[in-house]
């Protein structure tokens, strides 16, 4: 099948980095400067992406692969293939319509992007707050309050078996 196809279509022999040049009797010609073809058998080469403005070049364009961009310091990538750059905020902030704003009390953001998230509610897991949360850091949950009562050992012994219907004293 491959041999048949190549007999029928001489362009299928053109490797990546070249194109099948109809103007030159379907000879495989190298991609011109600032263009590439990532697969064989292509009739045109694609224009290389240019990393301009807030974008900077992460990987140069070659004859067989497109350039890759990332964002200038103070910005981060958005979208597939870093199609956009969005400004960073400081830790403890989130990006709102009005720019970077501090996290509200009870929320935190430990990154330069994304939104402020609520502190962990330790009591939902029956634990106590060991280290308070800040705008930049979540709370640290510690042992349950009962485990911290005077005389309690660091290892909680198994609870004694109780008869059904009896409430704990």
């Amino acid at each position: 099948f491959e041999r048949t196809r190549s007999l029928q279509d001489p362009c299928s022999n053109c490797p990546a980095g070249t194109f099948c040049d109809n103007n030159r009797n379907q000879i495989c010609s190298p991609c011109p400067p600032n263009s590439f073809s990532s697969a064989g058998g292509q009739r045109t080469c694609d224009i290389c992406r240019q990393c301009k403005g807030v974008f900077r070049t992460r990987k140069e364009c070659s004859s067989t692969s497109n350039a890759e961009c990332d964002c200038t310091p103070g910005f981060h990538c958005l979208g597939a293939g870093c199609s956009m750059c969005e400004q960073d905020c400081k830790q403890g902030q989130e990006l709102t319509k009005k720019g970077c704003k501090d996290c509200c009390f009870g929320t935190f953001n430990d990154q330069k992007r994304g939104i402020c998230r609520p502190w962990t509610n330790c009591s939902l897991d029956g634990k106590s707050v060991l280290v308070n949360g800040t705008k930049e850091r979540d709370v640290v949950c510690g042992p349950s309050p009962a485990d911290l009562s005077p005389g309690a050992s660091s290892v909680t012994p198994p609870a004694p078996a109780r008869e059904p219907g009896h409430s704990p004293q």
Epitope: G53, V54, F55, L78, S83, M84, E86, L95, K97, G99
Partner: nanobody, 123 residues
Framework: EVQLVESGGGLVQPGGSLRLSCGAS????????MLWFRQAPGEGLEWVAN????????YYVDSVEGRLTISRDNAKNALYLQMNSLRAEDTAIYYC????????????????WGQGTTVTVSS
């Protein structure tokens, strides 16, 4: 080719005014959020203001609120920044940038930038 070209910068005394313009070409200007950024000498890029597709939503960094006004004229493919009551700390290169095409919550993503125009506020 998608292009943004800023103009209107210059030297102005404190308390003075300037109007920056940004001409857009190569894309459907009215479909995109547009933004102004600035970069003061030795500093990083700072977002200044943005405006939605029809000009009904405008947002500003706190330090310029009430002094700078962003606007657009979709018929002329133009973005503007009216700068009043200028201060020394407004000295910077001002860039216009193309934002997102949708009406999503991310109003600060950009992909195309102009070359910038310099504003110097000094007596």
């Amino acid at each position: 080719e998608v292009q943004l070209v800023e103009s209107g910068g210059g030297l102005v005394q404190p308390g003075g005014s300037l109007r920056l313009s940004c001409g857009a070409s190569g894309f459907t200007f009215s479909s995109y959020w547009m933004l102004w950024f600035r970069q003061a000498p030795g500093e990083g890029l700072e977002w200044v203001a943005n405006i939605n597709q029809d000009g009904s939503e405008k947002y500003y960094v706190d330090s310029v609120e009430g002094r700078l006004t962003i606007s657009r004229d979709n018929a002329k493919n133009a973005l503007y920044l009216q700068m009043n009551s200028l201060r020394a700390e407004d000295t910077a290169i001002y860039y216009c940038a193309r934002g997102g095409e949708g009406y999503s919550d991310s109003h600060h993503g950009t992909d195309v930038w102009g070359q910038g125009t310099t504003v110097t506020v000094s007596s």
